[in-house]
């Protein structure tokens, strides 16, 4: 190698200056004894290199780029050799921003996967490789005192969520949770959440069913629907409240909400509906009165109300 570039920093804040030095060794005798070192950033020649001969016979050129406005570029030093430019060395320069503080960190406890799933917003693009780590610890109190650390959770590339598996959780005890973002220009940390995984439990909705007509039960009245629901298995012993929504299948009517219904009811007669009309119904539930998150709405159940019973008109004949 005849030349070697060294830079003040290969990664800088976008728009910051950068200084580079290119040294050509003396033993490159096939070169012009007083070669002119040229600088190129990407495809563009860069003026302003200050060249000097050092005491050991090597040639050095120093350049300061006042603002690096490219997020990624190659800086090279070269010599004119004949009619072509001979590249001596090149370095990759990166520019970007330190990571912003990750925000909107929130977590859900999923009893199906037995894991705590946390997500966040990473903030603006840094233009640099930036790693995110979900960090947590167990705490007996309100997270002022740190207990055992929990293994870091590292999301897959490009993802802004991570799952802490059951073996690292302690239910009914608080955990301190935060996100750390890190790149070559710095580190930032989100505000810390302090939560009991069970207080962020997200239930799955019950399964809505048509109530099987029993011989002794009266059929539904006109404008009424009889429903039942099957509770979600992992939530059998969790106190919940539920709500139902319904709308006619045809037309532009918006959803009408009915609730709260105790999950324990397991069946319900919904009245005040239009007779002989097809309705779409959904149900959702939340842990209650303890904290939790609403489940998603259940898959739709489609039912039709019965027709209004015929009324008998008595015709009076006048003689």
């Amino acid at each position: 190698e005849c030349g070697h570039i060294s830079v003040s920093a290969p990664i800088v804040h976008l728009g910051d200056p950068i200084t580079a030095s290119c040294i050509i060794k003396q033993n490159c005798s096939h070169l012009d004894p007083e070669p002119q070192i040229l600088w190129r950033l990407g495809a563009e020649l860069q003026p302003g290199g200050r060249q000097q001969r050092l005491s050991d016979g090597t040639q050095e050129s120093i350049i300061t780029l006042p603002h690096l406005n490219h997020t990624q570029a190659f800086l090279s030093c070269a010599l004119n050799w004949g009619n072509s430019l001979q590249i001596l060395d090149q370095v990759e320069l990166r520019a970007g921003y330190p990571p912003a503080i990750p925000h909107n960190l929130s977590c859900l406890m999923n009893l199906t996967t037995s894991s705590l799933i946390c997500q966040w917003e990473p903030g603006p693009e840094t233009h640099l490789p930036t790693s995110f780590t979900l960090k947590s610890f167990k705490s007996r109190g309100n997270c002022q005192t740190q207990g055992d650390s929990i293994l870091d959770c590292v999301p897959k590339d490009g993802q802004s969520h991570c799952s802490i598996p059951r073996k690292h959780l302690l239910l009914y005890q608080n955990m301190g949770i935060w996100v750390q973002a890190e790149n070559a220009l710095g580190t930032s940390m989100s505000p810390q959440l302090c939560l009991d995984p069970m207080d962020v439990v997200k239930l799955e909705p019950p399964m809505l069913r048509t109530m099987d007509p029993s011989p002794e039960a009266a059929p539904p009245q006109a404008g009424c629907l009889q429903l039942s629901w099957e509770p979600w298995q992992p939530g059998l012993h969790i106190n919940q409240k539920c709500e139902l929504r319904h709308k006619p299948q045809r037309g532009e009517a918006s959803w009408a909400l009915v609730g709260p219904l105790p999950l324990e009811a397991l069946q319900y007669e919904l009245c005040g509906l239009l007779p002989a009309t097809a309705y779409t119904l959904q149900i959702r539930c939340i842990r209650w009165p303890l904290p939790g998150h609403w489940s998603d709405w259940s898959p739709s159940l489609e039912l039709r109300t019965t027709e209004r019973a015929p009324t008998h008109h008595h015709h009076h004949h006048h003689h």
Partner: antibody
Framework: EVQLLESGGGLVQPGGSLRLSCAAS????????MGWVRQAPGKGLEWVSS????????PYADSVKGRFTISRDNSKNTLYLQMNSLRAEDTAVYYC???????????WGQGTLVTVSS | DIQMTQSPSSLSASVGDRVTITCRAS??????LNWYQQKPGKAPKLLIY???NLQNGVPSRFSGSGSGTDFTLTISSLQPEDFATYYC?????????FGGGTKVEIK
């Protein structure tokens, strides 16, 4: 401190009836499922029945279905087990227990012995 | 109904030994598996719930693992007060069945 105190056990003839009570204190009784678990002499634990916080759901073990009735009075913080048509195989220590949200028996009473014998 | 099979039904061990008890469910129960300790003449005591969560006040030498159908209770270093009978229980269904128990005796 959670306390569960069973009462009502004793000696009863086959075919007879008995009503067990469990007085609860130290927690908000109306928020928790409660249950009865029994243990025959020298045997393992057997789930008998449980009851949801407001009493609307009451599953039973097949061995007692139709003979035993679980109930609760949230105003009195008391759990009950009405046992009818008792058989010799119902002889056991009956434990009252408080269930957690994930179905675990978090707290247990000291137990009351029911002996069915002629 | 879900059957719970515990093994071994009894074992002899010495103080300081590592002891492992297994529990198998006849169908998948996710993580809904609890472990209890019972000493003669006493009510059972909850040790571990939801397969691996240590109940408050239970020494850290007790640990639980597994999911689906196969579960394990481990006592890392048996202490004199650990000689007792241990039961597993599934809470996946309303009918919360118990295993047959494992009696841990002094060798």
């Amino acid at each position: 401190e959670v306390q569960l105190l069973e009462s009502g056990g004793g000696l009863v003839q086959p075919g007879g009836s008995l009503r067990l009570s469990c007085a609860a204190s130290g927690f908000t009784f109306s928020l928790y499922w409660m249950g009865w678990v029994r243990q025959a002499p020298g045997k393992g634990l057997e789930w008998v029945s449980s009851i949801s916080s407001s009493g609307g759901v009451t599953p039973y073990a097949d061995s007692v279905k139709g003979r035993f009735t679980i109930s609760r009075d949230n105003s009195k913080n008391t759990l009950y087990l009405q046992m009818n048509s008792l058989r010799a195989e119902d002889t056991a220590v009956y434990y009252c227990a408080k269930l957690g949200e994930l179905g675990m028996y978090m707290n247990w009473g000291q137990g009351t012995l029911v002996t069915v014998s002629s | 109904d879900i059957q719970m099979t515990q093994s071994p039904s009894s074992l002899s061990a010495s103080v300081g030994d590592r002891v492992t008890i297994t529990c198998r469910a006849s169908q998948g129960i996710s993580s809904y598996l609890n472990w209890y300790q019972q000493k003669p003449g006493k009510a059972p005591k909850l040790l571990i719930y939801y397969a691996s969560n240590l109940q408050n006040g239970v020494p850290s030498r007790f640990s639980g693992s597994g999911s689906g159908t196969d579960f394990t209770l481990t006592i890392s270093s048996l202490q004199p007060e650990d000689f007792a009978t241990y039961y597993c229980q599934q809470s996946w269904t309303y009918g919360q069945t118990f295993g047959g128990g494992t009696k841990v005796e002094i060798k």
